[in-house]
């Protein structure tokens, strides 16, 4: 019989008492085969973290800073359940740390030196740790003691709770630096008042502070937010302009064998019986003998944290950077305007070899990081382990939902000013063998399908989106008799046709021979009835253009396109017979790396782009013998995006809507995790 006990860790007598009450009340409402609570008492949160890591306890609820500690080795804990605030319809699990300024003050984030600052309090998250952590490497040396470095960075501050004797500049705007509401500039509202009164130039608070203190929109319009990319935005655009997104209060557990499903089952049942306004005799979110015991008193309920989400992703790149800077106190030798090497994310060992060759030829401007799937690469870019990669539009959508931005677009047509003219896109098509003359768009049910990969544009999002509109369900593996859609569940019929050996079968990388455009076409040639690819795929792999044994004798005339009106057309008539127009592949990165990725890639394509004529004796960035490694092989150049610099603008309203509709069929664990952070 599996042990269904969750050992909750308590950090005080009062918490232990509430835990025992929680245990007893849960016993009375949950059947004997359901989850139960046991209580473990420790002296501190850090002791609880260690106890959970050592399998002496299972769960504890922590503030963001402690979630970071819990994640560090050797603890390796992960977030499993989040408290939410506000309403069930619009649950808030995060708050945003922001830098508020007056509208007419005219400086940016990188011009804060010498300004006057207002803080909620020394050592507090939004008011001190996050802004000072992010500014850490700009502080004058020596950076220890930290208070002295901060005092020398700003021309005057109010940092309540600071030592006014040792660091008078930190108390210049609020004499005495009182550590309670007796100090008019203490806390969130106090820091905002410090800005409002004109004492300071910038206030470090949370996003809701402005709304709580200024009910009137006209008054709020007198203020702006400083963004990390050195722009400003209106105060209501905090989701796109903040210093960090911070989880409020989170239950953590072991990463391996951490009982996360059991913890969720327990807490979900607990909130049903003892949540807000549920029971008189025991209330989960109430602390009669203290404050915030086990859970925050202001919480309204729990939400399950998606399993794909580790602590780094949950806390977010900015928060982790800020806290790491403060804790480790390490900065680059001397901050220069030079761009650091761009860490390119390569999929599996095939791309890694090409990336390594690029790295050698770039003289260290490019470094390489490996991952097994595109989603793993996106996650690495999010958390700073990697910086950039080029993605199909379907993954540009996921990357965008995860906070990444497009920087350059692949262009596939030769033109005089290729780099200045991003193209409208390519065509997603359905290809069949000419010999299968009875096959049309309307009778694909029961046929064998070949896809570039799950989540990709031409191979999945467009054809399956159209199909979904027709069949109104997501069971595509039942619609087709079998197929190869790399990235599907291994036991799915949509992995049956794949050719990868062993663990590589149906993997969404080049270890699966039927992966990508060329792979999906090969799948059609060798086993399938229909392949969903791009309009250039057939000509690129026929007429001897692909020397591989399976392709060298293929003829374009032996293939036809399926049109949406039920007719068929020759391959060259793709402009009048396609499923949809697809956005070109694009390079994505984090916002903080945008300028450097743009600069270095433009240099790199001038050195190794399509201007290089002899690829047998020189490195060519856009060539890999039809394997589309790192970039599509038909890329002519990487083009500027001009104003199409967000994923929505880049992909276009129509495509975003189409992928949005398919979201209910999504198996993307990363998309689930990212929409948890930003619904």
């Amino acid at each position: 019989v599996p042990d269904k006990t969750v050992r909750w860790c308590a950090v005080s007598e009062h918490e232990a008492t509430k835990c025992q009450s929680f245990r007893d009340h849960m016993k009375s409402v949950i059947p004997s085969d359901g989850p139960s609570v046991a209580c473990v008492k420790k002296a501190s949160y850090l002791d609880c973290i260690r106890a959970i890591a050592a399998n002496e306890a299972d769960a504890v609820t922590l503030d963001a800073g402690l979630v970071y500690d819990a994640y560090l080795a050797p603890n390796n804990l992960k977030p499993v359940v989040a408290e939410f605030y506000g309403s069930k319809e619009d649950p808030q699990t995060f708050y945003y740390a922001v830098a508020v300024v007056k509208k007419d003050s005219g400086f940016q984030m990188n011009q804060l030196r010498g300004k006057k600052s207002c803080h909620t309090g020394l050592g507090r998250s939004a008011g001190w740790n996050i802004p000072i952590g992010l500014l850490y490497c700009d502080l004058p040396e020596p950076r220890k003691p930290l208070e002295k470095a901060v005092a020398n960075f700003f021309s005057g501050s109010c940092a309540p709770c600071a030592d006014g004797t040792d660091f008078p500049q930190l108390c210049q705007l609020c004499p005495g630096c009182g550590c309670s509401t007796l100090n008019q500039y203490f806390g969130y509202s106090g820091a905002f008042k410090c800005l409002k009164d004109g004492a300071g130039d910038v206030a470090f608070v949370k996003h809701s502070t402005i709304f709580e203190n200024l009910a009137n929109k006209a008054d709020r319009d007198q203020y702006e937010l400083l963004c990390l990319d050195n722009t400003r935005k209106p105060v209501d655009e905090y989701k796109d302009c903040h210093l960090a997104q911070v989880p409020s209060h989170t239950v953590v557990a072991r990463s391996m064998g951490g009982k996360e499903d059991l913890i969720w089952e327990l807490l979900n049942q607990a909130q049903e019986h003892f949540g807000k306004d549920k029971s008189k005799e025991f209330q989960l979110f109430s602390s009669p003998h203290g404050k915030d015991l086990l859970f925050k008193d202001s919480a309204h309920g729990f939400l399950k944290v998606p399993p794909r989400m580790d602590a780094k992703m949950y806390l977010g790149y900015e928060y982790v950077t800020a806290i790491r800077n403060l804790r480790e106190g390490t900065c680059p030798e001397a901050p220069t305007d030079e761009c650091k090497p761009v860490k390119w994310c390569a999929l599996s060992h095939h791309e890694r070899l090409k990336c390594d060759e690029w790295s050698v030829n770039s003289v260290g401007k490019i470094e390489c990081v490996s991952a097994e799937t595109t989603e793993d690469c996106i996650a690495k870019i999010m958390n700073g382990e990697a910086d950039a990669m080029s993605l199909d539009g379907g993954f540009v959508y996921i990357a965008g939902k995860c906070g990444l931005v497009p920087v350059l677009a692949e262009n596939y047509n030769k033109s005089d000013n290729c780099e200045d003219t991003p193209e409208a896109g390519y065509f997603a098509i359905a290809v069949v063998k000419k010999s299968a003359s009875d096959l049309t768009w309307d009778n694909l049910k029961g046929k064998k399908s070949c896809h570039t990969a799950v989540g990709r544009t031409a191979g999945w999002n467009i054809p399956m989106g159209l199909l979904y509109n027709k069949i109104n369900h997501c069971r595509f593996d039942e619609f087709f008799s079998e197929g190869c859609a790399p990235g599907s569940k291994k036991d799915s019929s949509l992995c049956k046709l794949c050719m990868g050996s062993g663990l590589n079968l149906c993997e969404p990388n080049n270890k699966e021979g039927y992966y990508g455009y060329t792979g999906a076409f090969r799948c059609l040639v060798e086993k399938g009835d229909v392949a969903f690819v791009k309009h250039q795929t057939v000509p690129q792999n026929t007429g001897g253009k692909n020397p591989d044994p399976w392709a060298k004798n293929l003829n374009e005339k032996d293939y036809e396109l399926l049109c949406l009106d039920g007719t068929r057309k020759p391959v060259e008539e793709y402009a009048n017979c396609h499923l949809a127009r697809a956005p070109n592949h694009a390079v994505v990165t984090r916002k903080d790396k945008e300028a450097c990725v743009h600069k270095i890639l433009r240099q790199q394509q001038h050195l190794f782009g399509s201007n290089v004529t002899d690829c047998s004796g020189n490195f060519c960035l856009f060539r890999s013998e039809t394997k589309d490694l790192l970039f599509r092989d038909d890329t002519v150049c990487l083009a500027k995006l001009h104003d199409r610099n967000t994923y929505e603008k880049y992909l276009g309203e129509e495509y975003v809507k189409a992928v949005g509709n398919l979201r209910k069929c999504s198996t993307s664990s990363l998309l689930e995790a990212c929409t948890f952070r930003r619904p």
């Epitope: 791309e351 070899l353 090409k354 047998s616 004796g617 890999s624 013998e625 394997k627």
Partner: nanobody, 117 residues
């Protein structure tokens, strides 16, 4: 396609030196990029050093300042001079010319380097 044969490995004490050679069966003068990789037991194969036709070199962070890659086009050979060797340099070392397409795994036998006291 040229065949590459690695040699020069062996057992050496920490702090010692070795010089690895990679002899090609044909001309390497027209080959753009040559590189040394290594693979320790249970680890992924990793790039150690690379050199282009023009003599530009790149090194992995862990070997910078200790290893030197060079090529002699007349002798159709690429070298890896390894100084101040550490136990963590223990691995099988392979040479590649990247000319066999990236997705074909044409690796030679490699040469074993063991750093131990």
């Amino acid at each position: 396609q040229v065949q590459l044969v690695e040699s020069g490995g062996g057992l050496v004490q920490p702090g010692g030196s070795l010089r690895l050679s990679c002899a090609a069966s044909g001309s390497i003068a027209s080959i753009n990029t040559m590189a040394w990789y290594r693979q320790a037991p249970g680890k992924q194969r990793e790039l150690v050093a690379g050199i282009t036709r023009s003599g530009t070199t790149t090194y992995a962070g862990s070997v910078k300042g200790r290893f030197t890659i060079s090529r002699d086009n007349a002798k159709n050979t690429v070298y890896l001079q390894m100084n101040s060797l550490k136990p963590e340099d223990t691995a099988v070392y392979y040479c590649t010319d990247y000319s066999s397409s990236y997705y074909q795994d044409y690796w030679g036998q490699g040469t074993q380097v063991t750093v131990s006291s």
